[in-house]
């Protein structure tokens, strides 16, 4: 049975040319994190983390995407095209695969607030 | 002992199509990239694409769209390559690799041998 | 595409000789480099991951250095098991290329 839920930080902001963490956390579950996925709007890849193996970064991410902190990514040079939802996929043993999504929003105007609140969703 | 087993050498006929298979024994196959990647003398190596068993991710060299399609099977922890519409120029050696973040293609296959005759 | 060019097709060595090897990328690929070690009829070996670090079981005569463009595989006390090719392979960005590959021939 899947008791877990998955927090994530939920709908973000933050300014062209800058940088955003995109984390997600499971809770009120022992269950053991074997592998999170990192997926852009369109479902394409952006990173895993393996609890045996580290992180593999996405070869077109690479210049851009910095593993952490812990199982988050940070998206860096941000530009308006990575407006958009981003799925964290939690794989566990023995719970199964809990999913969380963070939308974010970039903005062109230079007073844009990155606001990152942890949000059931 | 980490080993990619892969398939014996194929004959095959120009226009057809041939499917080779590469077994990883020795570590969890859903964990790591699989590879395949052509040699042909005096050509060199060229990477034709990876799939990851543990999400179905699949990249491929453009070069090789339309010509490869990868497939994996996780309960028999097998990656499969097709090869369709065979000219003299598909003729070569595949190998299969496994692969990860730093680790890109550690351990490799004995590989396939393909040869396109009629 | 990156291309990795490896200018030296042959290099001739004695046993005891040091040789290096060494791999040009048309564009900066950091550190992402793997050098292998093909002998004939075998499958490639892996020999260097990350540009200068030693795959498990590999001897220590075999160092790796560089980043960014220009990789160097150095064969210190060569062997005449080292007969074999060696070529480099960029994993920066897809599609992974390879370098042309160096013979090594042992006098």
């Known amino acids: 049975m899947m008791t877990g839920t998955i927090e994530t930080t939920g709908n973000i902001s933050a300014k062209k040319g800058g940088s955003v963490i995109l984390q997600c956390h499971l809770s009120s579950t022992m269950a053991q994190v074997t592998q999170v996925n990192w997926e852009q709007h369109d479902h394409s890849l952006l990173a895993i983390r393996n609890a045996e193996l580290g992180w593999h970064i996405y070869p077109a991410f690479k210049d851009r995407v910095a593993p952490g902190p812990g199982l988050g990514l940070t998206l860096q040079s941000l530009t308006m095209n990575d407006t958009g939802e981003y799925f964290c996929t939690y794989h566990t043993y023995p719970d199964g695969t809990y999913r969380g999504r963070i939308f974010l929003e970039v903005l062109e105007s230079s007073v844009a607030e990155h606001s990152a609140r942890f949000q059931i969703p | 002992q980490i080993q990619l087993q892969q398939s014996g050498a194929e004959l095959v006929r120009p226009g057809t199509s041939v499917k080779m298979s590469c077994k990883a024994v020795?570590?969890?196959?859903?964990?790591?990239?699989i590879n395949w990647v052509k040699q042909r003398p005096g050509h060199g190596f060229e990477w034709i694409g990876d799939i990851y068993p543990g999400g179905y991710y699949i990249n491929y060299n453009e070069k090789f769209k339309g010509k490869a399609t990868l497939t994996a099977d996780t309960s028999s922890s097998t990656a499969y390559m097709q090869l369709s519409s065979l000219t003299s120029e598909d003729s070569a050696i595949y190998y299969c690799?496994?692969?990860?973040?730093?680790?890109?293609?550690?351990?490799w296959g004995q590989g396939t041998s393909v040869t396109v005759s009629s | 595409d990156i291309v990795m060019t490896q200018s030296q097709k042959f290099m001739s060595t004695s046993v005891g000789d040091r040789v290096s090897i060494t791999c040009k990328a048309s564009q900066n690929v950091r550190t992402d480099v793997v050098w292998y070690q093909q002998k004939p009829g075998q499958s490639p070996k892996a020999l260097i991951f990350?540009?200068?670090n030693r795959h498990t079981g590999v001897p220590d005569r075999f160092t790796g250095s560089g980043s960014g463009t220009d990789f160097t595989l150095t064969i210190s006390n060569v062997q005449s098991e080292d007969l074999a090719d060696y070529f480099c392979?960029?994993?920066?960005?897809?599609?992974?290329?390879f370098g042309g590959g160096t013979k090594l021939e042992i006098k």
């Open positions: 392979l960029q994993h920066w960005n897809y599609p992974y290329t």
């Open positions: 990350l540009a200068s």
């Open positions: 690799a496994r692969g990860y973040g730093s680790y890109a293609m550690d351990y």
């Open positions: 020795g570590y969890t196959f859903t964990n790591y990239w």
